[in-house]
Interface confidence: medium
């Protein structure tokens, strides 16, 4: 795994965002701002966006900035998984995707980033101050989690700015290593901002690679420093969490199966039974660090299109094998 501070690839500003600031003067502060936000060796970014067309619909995008292969991604809301959070979707690179209401569509965007669209209707509608968390696991090296939310005052169609994750394990070496550069960069950024404070500045929309301060490496050098830097999870308003969601998939929840013909609703002996959308075909470079998954063809292929999964009322043994996540 890399230990240097990572700056995500920046995309060019979207049309209409340059405003009075020229392209060059816009990009440099943005790079520096990104550097400031990515201090502490970030690994996971989270972006929450409210759709302009459907005010109760949210899109959550999450990405992993490390170099290992992703074994599992869990998206939850209401806080981190295991700390009061409720699972919305579980994405597996080979076995596919499982999702629970109000998640409408979870999908892989790249081999290390995902997106999730949330339906917003009735009791299970998310609201602006809901916290969404993404946990990326790379077995057996570790897992990294970051959370984000949409500020209540955000305009529809705008993304949440990167905010520090409530779970934080900072890599001290990463912080110290870039602190000098950051100090200079942040001072210069302030200087630029002061220069432009009398000019009409456009409203910036963070690119989809906006980083989120992470739960940095679980194997950071010093456990003591991890403990010292651990930020307790803040209390959040959970009034928007659905009353019905936990009953939809109670602990030890049911098996999950796809709307396949009866003969197909059966777990094959191989581990490719999440009958849902697999990750797009991987290139040969993905035979990465933890060695769990190599190239796409090396596990049994999926036998169907992306399918909506729903709970099986017959209980945990409706299908062979342990399929229930929650």
């Amino acid at each position: 795994m890399r230990t240097e501070a990572q700056v995500p690839a920046l995309q060019p500003p979207e049309p209409g965002l340059e405003g009075a600031m020229g392209h060059r003067t816009l990009v440099l502060p943005w790079v520096l701002l990104t550097l400031c936000v990515t201090a502490g060796t970030p690994e996971v970014w989270v972006q929450v966006r409210m759709e302009a067309t459907e005010l109760s619909s949210f899109t959550i995008r999450c990405g992993f900035l490390g170099s290992g292969s992703i074994s599992l991604v869990t998206v939850s809301w209401g806080g981190p998984n295991g700390a009061g959070g409720t699972t919305l979707a579980v994405l597996h690179p080979e076995r596919g995707i499982r999702q629970w209401a109000p998640a409408r569509q979870a999908r892989w965007e790249t081999q290390s980033s995902i997106s999730l669209i949330l339906e917003g209707s009735g009791a299970s509608s998310p609201c602006a101050n809901t916290t969404f968390c993404c946990k990326f696991a790379s077995f057996p090296e570790g897992s990294w989690e970051a959370c984000g939310s949409l500020p209540p005052s955000s305009d529809p169609g705008l993304s949440a700015p990167p905010t520090p994750a409530p779970i934080l394990r900072a890599d001290l070496a990463g912080i110290l290593g870039v602190s000098g550069v950051l100090l200079f960069g942040c001072v210069y950024l302030l200087h630029l901002l002061r220069r432009h404070k009398h000019r009409p500045a456009p409203r910036l929309q963070p690119s989809r690679t906006s980083p989120q301060a992470p739960r940095a490496r679980a194997w950071a050098p010093s456990q003591a420093s991890q403990a010292a830097l651990h930020v307790p999870y803040a209390t959040i308003n959970t009034s928007c969490r659905p009353a019905t969601l936990d009953t939809a998939h109670p602990h030890g929840g049911p098996s999950w199966w796809a709307s396949l013909p009866t003969h197909a609703a059966h777990r094959p002996q191989g581990p490719a039974a999440w009958a849902s959308t697999p990750i797009p075909a991987r290139g040969s470079f993905v035979s990465v660090e933890n060695g769990l998954y190599a190239q796409a063809g090396e596990r049994p292929p999926h036998t169907g299109p992306g399918l909506t999964l729903f709970p099986d009322p017959r209980g945990p043994r409706a299908m062979e094998g342990p399929l229930g996540v929650r």
Epitope: N81, P140, E141, H251, S287, G291, A294
Partner: antibody, heavy 120, light 106 residues
Framework: EVMLVESGGGLVKPGGSLKLSCAAS????????MSWVRQTPEKRLECVAT????????YYPDSVKGRFSISRDNAKNTLYLQMSSLRSEDTALYYC?????????????WGQGTSVTVSS | QIVLTQSPAIMSASPGEKVTMTCSAN?????IYWYQQKPGSSPRLLIY???NLASGVPVRFSGSGSGTSYYLTISRMEAEDAATYYC?????????FGSGTKLEIK
């Protein structure tokens, strides 16, 4: 039915070597990550080696690094643990276990164990 | 590496009684699992990712917790629940186990 059957344990002198085997059946062995976990006479559990499913990368805690080597033969559906420079503290019941990613990589199936005693 | 401490080391409960045992970590962990081991048998997975029951596990078992403190609860103790219970973490390699809680029937 998933089955894991360990063999190869026995009595060995300090500094000696031993190779444990775990025969797997009832599942697609090559796709799964596997571990060797030992249980000491005091009933403490310790994971001593893990191997990835497809790429076969290996992981060891410091207590056995350089002395133990995990490997697999996917054609034979068999997991191995080569132990060398054995010490008295390696005396334990050795289990092989499967990591199930539906269960977030918990060890969902374990063998019955094979006993290793290191004594002079 | 992460150290897991289980408490109490030994406890006893009457049939029908509620039982709770604790697993404490010296650092925040990502995933916690609970296993049950009966004398002469291999460990059996009970709970994964803090609170999810593995297949075939009775619903009287439940898991909870976050950060550094995790709990295994048996809502109504039964004779067959007498066993040793181990927690295990996966935040990074190596996976580590707690020292176990031995649950006896009164």
């Amino acid at each position: 039915e998933v089955m894991l059957v360990e063999s190869g344990g026995g009595l060995v002198k300090p500094g000696g070597s031993l190779k444990l085997s775990c025969a797997a059946s009832g599942f697609s062995f090559s796709s799964y990550s596997m571990s060797w976990v030992r249980q000491t006479p005091e009933k403490r559990l310790e994971c001593v080696a893990t191997i990835g499913g497809v790429g076969g990368n290996t992981y060891y805690p410091d207590s056995v690094k350089g002395r133990f080597s995990i490997s697999r033969d996917n054609a034979k559906n068999t997991l191995y643990l080569q132990m060398s420079s054995l010490r008295s503290e390696d005396t334990a019941l050795y289990y092989c276990a499967r990591h199930e990613d539906y269960y977030y990589y918990a060890m969902d199936y374990w063998g019955q164990g094979t006993s290793v005693t290191v004594s002079s | 590496q992460i150290v897991l401490t289980q408490s109490p080391a030994i406890m006893s409960a009457s049939p029908g009684e509620k039982v709770t045992m604790t697993c404490s970590a010296n650092s925040t962990v990502s995933y916690i699992y609970w296993y049950q081991q009966k004398p002469g048998s291999s460990p059996r997975l009970l709970i994964y990712d803090t609170s999810n029951l593995a297949s075939g596990v009775p619903v009287r078992f439940s898991g909870s917790g976050s950060g550094t403190s995790y709990y295994l609860t048996i809502s109504r103790m039964e004779a067959e629940d007498a066993a040793t219970y181990y927690c295990q973490q996966w935040s990074s390699f190596p996976f580590t186990f707690g020292s176990g809680t031995k649950l006896e029937i009164k």
